[in-house]
């Protein structure tokens, strides 16, 4: 969370940004809020990126002004016009690229004053893992798969019964490059699993941490997964 202040004459407005992460190939949001202003035609929103000449996006006099937009962002940006009234200057970024990572500035001007704040935008790939029982193996095993990760993550297994146990000797993890030659498919197999136990497959890089849980009993298999972005908020 970054809060910036700006001064215009004797007036300043608070602008707040949130560090966030973008999933390459998908749409992302760069979050920015400001003190709402009743005079809508005086609101100017500018998004800038460190090291880039020109603007990422500009919104003024009630509409987008893309005359100074850098070509790498052409056709990929939008503000949420209906949210500007409540002080939301967040930027929608379509088809996030690895090169979109960097430091962005959200600059706001209203009839009350001006202000700005920076945000760090990280880009990579992250996805939910899915764990299945691998009945084809010689001994009962679990297969944890996640389709898209970048940079290469670490994978670790844990179990509710054997807390603190090291499963690296009884697991095998592989990374398979996807067709776009950037992201990778993560596959990890855990051998010699026992029934009536809950196992967790944890995949983590510097952007995200994902966990898949599976509980295998005689009568049923229960699954749960969650994904958490790191250093956000």
């Amino acid at each position: 969370l970054i809060i910036g202040f700006g001064i215009s004459g004797k007036h300043f407005i608070t602008v707040t940004t949130f560090t966030s992460a973008g999933n390459i190939g998908e749409d992302g949001t760069l979050s920015c809020t400001f003190e709402p202003d009743i005079k809508l035609n005086g609101i100017v929103i500018q998004w800038l990126k460190e090291g880039i000449k020109g603007l990422v996006h500009e919104f003024k006099e009630g509409k987008d002004d893309l005359s100074q937009q850098h070509e790498m962002f052409r056709g990929r940006t939008a503000v949420f016009a209906d949210q500007v009234v409540v002080g939301n200057a967040s930027l929608r970024l379509k088809n996030v690229q690895l090169t979109d990572a960097g430091t962005y500035t959200c600059y706001i001007r209203t009839s009350k004053g001006k202000g700005n704040a920076n945000l760090e935008y990280k880009t990579g790939a992250f996805s939910m893992p899915e764990i299945n029982v691998d009945y084809n193996a010689s001994s009962e095993s679990l297969r944890c798969e996640a389709p898209r990760w970048f940079p290469q993550p670490t994978v670790a297994w844990a179990s509710q019964v054997d807390q603190g146990a090291n499963f690296s000797e009884v697991s095998n993890t592989s990374f398979e490059l996807n067709s776009e030659n950037v992201t990778m498919k993560v596959v990890s197999v855990l051998y010699n699993v026992t029934i009536n136990n809950t196992y967790s497959c944890m995949i983590e890089n510097d952007i995200a941490k994902a966990t898949g849980d599976i509980k295998v009993t005689d009568s049923e298999v229960k699954r749960r997964s969650q994904l958490q972005l790191l250093n956000s908020g």
């Epitope: 009743i38 809508l40 409540v86």
Partner: antibody
Framework: QVQLVQSGAEVKKPGSSMRVSCKAS????????ISWVRQAPGQGLEWMGG????????NYAQKFQGRVTITADKSTSTAYMELSSLRSEDTAVYYC?????????WGQGTLVTVSS | EIVMTQSPASLSVSPGERATLSCRAS??????LAWYQQKPGQAPRLLIY???TRATGIPARVSGGGSGTEFTLTISSLQSEDFAVYCC?????????FGPGTKLEIK
């Protein structure tokens, strides 16, 4: 001087529709949002929705979604609020106001009575 | 939707004294809060926005404070024209929501 002038009081039958107008100055229309707020007899204020002609956006409170339509005619600087499928609980004073996010000028109010 | 509550529902104060009215939001609204005064048969009048900024023409004896979920409106040295209903409104998120109001009465 900012002025919001609303249409006159109406009596409506249950199931019918109502339409209230709100004429504003040209500057108000080009620079601000116009919202609609209602107040049932002896009750508090209730935001129904609003339009920001400069942004080309309109937002509605979920309670009224599908029943309320807010429009703006830039050529006459007039905003309209239409509420359909009226019931007795819709009896209220309907105000137009300059804003969101907050409301600094208000119309005089239009009393709409829904009665069979 | 953010629910606004106000306390007390009514308050009796003598002219010349101070009145403090409270408004609470069900979740943080930062400083995105306004206060209005309404007299019988009249439209509401904006007093405060941004939790503490007085609207044009509002006297200095009217002040607002607070942020997040807890807010106050204080009127020092009450005058006859101050006796009315006061309500708060959040504008952090759509839909905008109002508190039920506090009726300030002459003691």
């Amino acid at each position: 001087q900012v002025q919001l002038v609303q249409s006159g009081a109406e009596v409506k039958k249950p199931g019918s529709s109502m339409r209230v107008s709100c004429k504003a100055s040209e500057d108000t229309f080009s620079s601000y949002a116009i919202s609609w707020v209602r107040q049932a007899p002896g009750q508090g204020l209730e935001w129904m929705g609003g339009t920001a002609p400069i942004f080309g956006t309109t937002n509605y409170a979920q309670k009224f979604q599908g029943r309320v339509t807010i429009t703006a005619d830039k050529s006459t600087s007039t905003a309209y609020m239409e509420l359909s499928s009226l019931r007795s609980e819709d009896t209220a004073v309907y105000y137009c106001a300059r804003g969101g996010p907050y409301f600094d000028y208000w119309g005089q109010g239009t009393l709409v009575t829904v009665s069979s | 939707e953010i629910v606004m509550t106000q306390s007390p529902a009514s308050l009796s104060v003598s002219p010349g004294e101070r009145a403090t009215l409270s408004c609470r939001a069900s979740q943080s609204v930062s400083s995105n809060l306004a206060w209005y005064q309404q007299k019988p048969g009249q439209a509401p009048r904006l007093l405060i926005y941004g939790a503490s900024t007085r609207a044009t023409g509002i006297p200095a004896r009217v002040s607002g404070g607070g942020s997040g979920t807890e807010f106050t409106l204080t009127i020092s040295s009450l005058q006859s024209e101050d006796f009315a209903v006061y309500c708060c409104q959040q504008y952090k998120n759509w839909p905008f929501t109002f508190g039920p109001g506090t009726k300030l009465e002459i003691k």
